[in-house]
């Protein structure tokens, strides 16, 4: 069976072909090349030498038991090569020699015993080690890792390293990869000697069901003293054991340690007294919870100075309060329980998302709703009941809103959005918004992007709401029941590259309303009813419009639409897709495509 | 089409098919099985992805007693920092998890349960399993 | 086992031409994918051309128009033909079969 072309004379899929060997028919310029589950079992020297532009390799699950000297010997340009769930029992010394370029090695579940015996230490390029899943015991990382002075990721996580001494690390001392972002997870660790971590710098640390008990968790935390690291993940995972006991004294040894983000990541425990339990982290930049219950929620009134929260898939007793004031970042998502949002008092905030929470807002939105002036960035997406009772009073540095899919109230009653004059984005799809007043948009001088699918209008009539947004270059009217608009409805937005008229309702096409429309590139009236044109004579559209979609309409392709088949024929350069514009009448033409037709109409008429 | 016996209780008898053309080995195990009265066990999976399980999310689709329910999305794995640790199970790397469930009060009716669940992973999405499950459901006198 | 010789190598002047062989021996190469892979002294390994059994052949841009490799299945015998010899040509010169191994190399030295 032959391997699938994803792209010529590039990628190719190989898959399960049960290949006993590397296939000899692939051109020489394949660049991605996946062997995976494939019973090679063993690779002699130079066993890609037919693929000298080759520059990922997925050899996953291939049963290779023996790498000889040199087998990627000729894969000069090969940036990653992915070895997982292979039984390795033999690597030779030069198994990986030749790969010059080599940016990410993933040797995943492959009898990897040690790093010692790894024969990576020429690897100059390397950016990712990732050893997960494998038989190691120690971390100690050897001499050679100084010449690895690229490398950005090493995971070890799922291994057996139960201990860390302070000469395990001391090649990190002489080299100091800032950049370095270690995952430790899921090996057995019962023992950090003290010091073993001193002044070394990290980027990231992720230590998660490392600990059988509370007070390994506590000595190992101790141990990680005098470490310098940018971003600290701790925490469990939902589906491996979990600690029976968890307390304030678990972190205290973060004190003795210099960290810029922290975040704890699933925790099978009810978190009461976050103050104390923090207490080491209250000067962090960044601070996150994800998939903790959290009890008491007064406690994020306290003063703490981070920057950013983060509290995503929580589960709280109800909405809690915030009271930061040096807080320029929120995010608080997918969490559960306190379905009606509070008040919020942050002074400094930015960027507020809010999404996916199943929130209901009895009015919104102003200032006091948030505590600050500075907000840039607002998402209350796909949440509950949105009660619109004020226009964004105090929030008038507001570039980015979302409310797509939440449920918007008293939006036809006043001009909502009239205070937001630096509004750049605004999604209201899909947000049973039923536009009966012409003002809806009045304000919004700056946007440039506009999403309302989903929603509906008055009569099914497009009127002139789009009159203020001169700066509009993105318009989504799909899906909004629409039978009519008025030839000026588009008269004023002279920078929209981007129309989706499509799945409406519309029977016919008129070019007369997009006269105005100087930078339209894409126009989208799919999934339409049209059957012909609104006047006979359709004038052209805009020049600059590139791509124009008229497909899956009902087209009657019949002698009196003659001029209108024609007239599509004629723009046949913009159309996409036209293999999907077909006759949906007359019944003996059904079905046929529409560009395909030759309509000769020296019929008796 | 071959059906997989996975466990009987009191009250139901599941078992389950492939719906997709690789029908990819995969092995579950409840214990104790599933009783739809109130249940509390552990599912236990042994699978070897054909492909990374990064952003995995289930496709839901249950009939009961031929009447459709909506489609249900269920995300399991978002990407980054999950609550699982397959999660971050690459392909070709062996999957051996047990999962802890419990569920209680819910009142279901006597008749035949299908649950189609497809399994999309990866970036670009693509489907990594579909299985579809047949719980019989006989709810007993007490 | 298999073995691979190789032969022709030289000092030649810049312009000119040499002839490299390659005998196989516990092996038939007419199913084999070969080639040649020179070593340059404190420079990167390159493929410097590579046949394969239904006859096509691949080239870098560095030797492409000068070098034609070829195969005699009779002789279980692979030749590279260069011509236009550069200085940058020079290096040991190895006779390859993928996946099998490699031969003790050739040197090749062009000379101004």
């Known amino acids: 069976e032959p391997c699938v072309e994803v792209v010529p004379n590039i990628t190719y899929q190989c898959m399960e072909l049960n290949f006993y060997k590397i296939p000899d028919n692939l051109p020489f310029s394949t660049k991605n090349l996946d062997l995976s589950f494939n019973p090679l079992r063993h690779l002699g020297s130079y066993s890609f030498f037919s693929f000298p532009e080759l520059q990922v390799l997925d050899l996953s699950r291939c049963e290779i038991q023996t790498i000889e000297d040199g087998a990627y010997q000729s894969l000069s340009h090969l940036s990653t090569l992915i070895l997982t769930g292979n039984p390795i029992q033999s690597l030779a010394l030069g198994a990986f020699s030749g790969l010059s370029s080599l940016q990410k090695l993933v040797a995943v579940e492959t009898n990897l015993a040690s790093l010692e015996n790894f024969p990576i230490g020429h690897l100059k390029t390397l950016k990712e080690l990732n050893v997960a899943h494998n038989l190691i015991q120690s971390f100690k990382l050897p001499e050679y890792f100084s010449n690895l002075t690229n490398l950005e990721h090493l995971d070890l996580s799922s291994n057996k390293i139960q201990s860390i001494y302070c000469t395990d690390l001391r090649v990190l001392h002489q080299m100091p990869l800032l950049n370095l972002s270690l995952d430790l997870s899921l090996n057995p660790m019962n023992f950090i000697q003290p010091g073993a971590f001193k002044e070394i710098r990290l980027h990231k640390l992720t230590l998660r069901n490392n600990f059988d008990s509370l007070n390994v968790m506590k000595t190992c935390i101790q141990g990680l003293a005098g470490l310098e690291v940018h971003r600290l993940v701790l925490g469990e995972f939902r589906n491996e054991g979990n600690l029976e006991k968890f307390d304030k004294s678990a972190l205290e040894g973060l004190c003795n340690l210099t960290i810029e983000e922290f975040r704890l990541a699933y925790l099978d425990y009810y978190l009461d007294d976050i103050i104390d339990l923090f207490n080491c982290l209250t000067n962090v930049s960044s601070f996150s919870l994800v998939s903790v219950t959290i009890e008491r929620v007064k406690d994020f009134s306290y003063n703490f100075g981070w920057q950013h929260l983060e509290l995503v898939n929580c589960k709280f007793g109800q909405f809690p309060t915030l009271k930061l004031k040096s807080l320029k970042r929120l995010t608080f998502t997918s969490n559960k329980g306190g379905n009606a949002f509070s008040e919020v008092d942050l002074p400094s905030l930015e960027f507020l998302d809010l999404s996916r929470n199943g929130l209901s807002f009895k009015g919104c939105c102003s200032q006091s709703d948030f505590g600050t002036t500075s907000l840039k960035y607002l998402d209350l997406s796909f949440n509950g009941v949105i009660t619109m009772s004020s226009n964004f009073l105090g929030l008038e540095q507001l570039e980015h809103l979302d409310f797509q899919h939440s449920n918007l109230k008293q939006m036809s009653e006043f001009s909502v959005f009239l205070s937001l004059r630096n509004l750049i984005y605004l999604d209201i799809s899909h947000t049973h918004t039923r536009v009966a007043f012409n003002g809806i948009f009045n304000g919004l001088s700056s946007l440039e992007v506009l999403k309302m699918a989903g929603n509906s209008f008055q009569e099914n009539f497009l009127p002139d709401i789009f009159t203020e947004l001169r700066n509009l270059t993105f318009l989504d009217l799909s899906q909004c029941q629409l039978e009519q608009l008025s030839p000026t409805a588009f008269n004023s937005l002279s920078s929209l590259q981007v129309l989706n008229m499509s799945h409406n309702n519309f029977f016919s096409l008129d070019t007369f309303p997009y006269k105005c429309l100087n930078s339209l590139q894409v126009l989208d009236y799919s999934l339409n009813h049209i059957m012909t044109s609104k006047k006979q004579e359709l004038q052209h559209f805009p020049s600059s419009l590139a791509f124009l979609n008229l497909t899956q309409n009902d087209f009657a392709c019949t002698c009196e639409h003659q001029s209108f088949l024609q007239w599509i024929k004629d723009q046949r350069q913009l159309l996409v897709e036209v293999e999907r514009m077909e006759c949906a009448t007359p019944s003996d033409k059904q079905g046929m495509p529409v560009l395909s037709l030759n309509i000769t109409c020296q019929m008796n008429k | 089409q071959k059906q997989y016996w996975v466990c009987n209780s009191s009250d139901a008898s599941i078992s389950y098919t492939y719906c997709d053309k690789m029908q990819y080995p995969i092995s579950i195990n409840v214990n104790p099985c599933i009783e739809l009265k109130r249940s509390k066990g552990l599912l236990h999976i042994f699978y070897i992805p054909r492909r990374d399980l990064k952003q995995l999310y289930f496709n839901l689709y249950i009939t009961v007693n031929t009447m459709n329910l909506p489609k249900r999305k269920e995300v399991i794995c978002r990407g980054s920092d999950d609550d699982y640790s397959f999660c971050r199970a690459l392909k070709g790397e062996t999957v051996n998890t047990t999962i802890s469930f419990s569920f209680k009060g819910i009142k279901f009716s006597k008749g035949k349960y299908k649950c189609v669940v497809e399994a999309i992973s990866g970036s670009p999405e693509e489907m990594l399993f579909c299985l579809e499950f047949v719980i019989l459901h006989q709810p007993n006198s007490n | 086992e298999v073995q691979l010789v190789e032969s022709g190598g030289g000092l030649v002047q810049a312009g000119e031409s040499l002839r490299l062989s390659c005998v196989a021996s516990?092996?038939?190469?007419?199913?084999?994918?070969m080639g040649w892979w020179r070593q340059a002294p404190g420079k990167q390994g390159e493929s410097v051309a590579i046949l394969k059994s239904d006859g096509t052949t691949y080239y870098p841009d560095s030797v492409k128009g000068r070098f034609a490799i070829s195969r005699d299945n009779a002789k279980n015998t692979v030749y590279l033909q260069m011509s236009s010899l550069k200085l940058e040509d020079t290096g040991v010169y190895y006779c390859?079969?993928?996946?099998?191994?490699r031969g003790q190399g050739t040197q090749v030295t062009v000379s101004s």
């Open positions: 516990g092996i038939s190469i007419s199913t084999e994918i």
């Open positions: 390859i079969i993928a996946g099998r191994g």
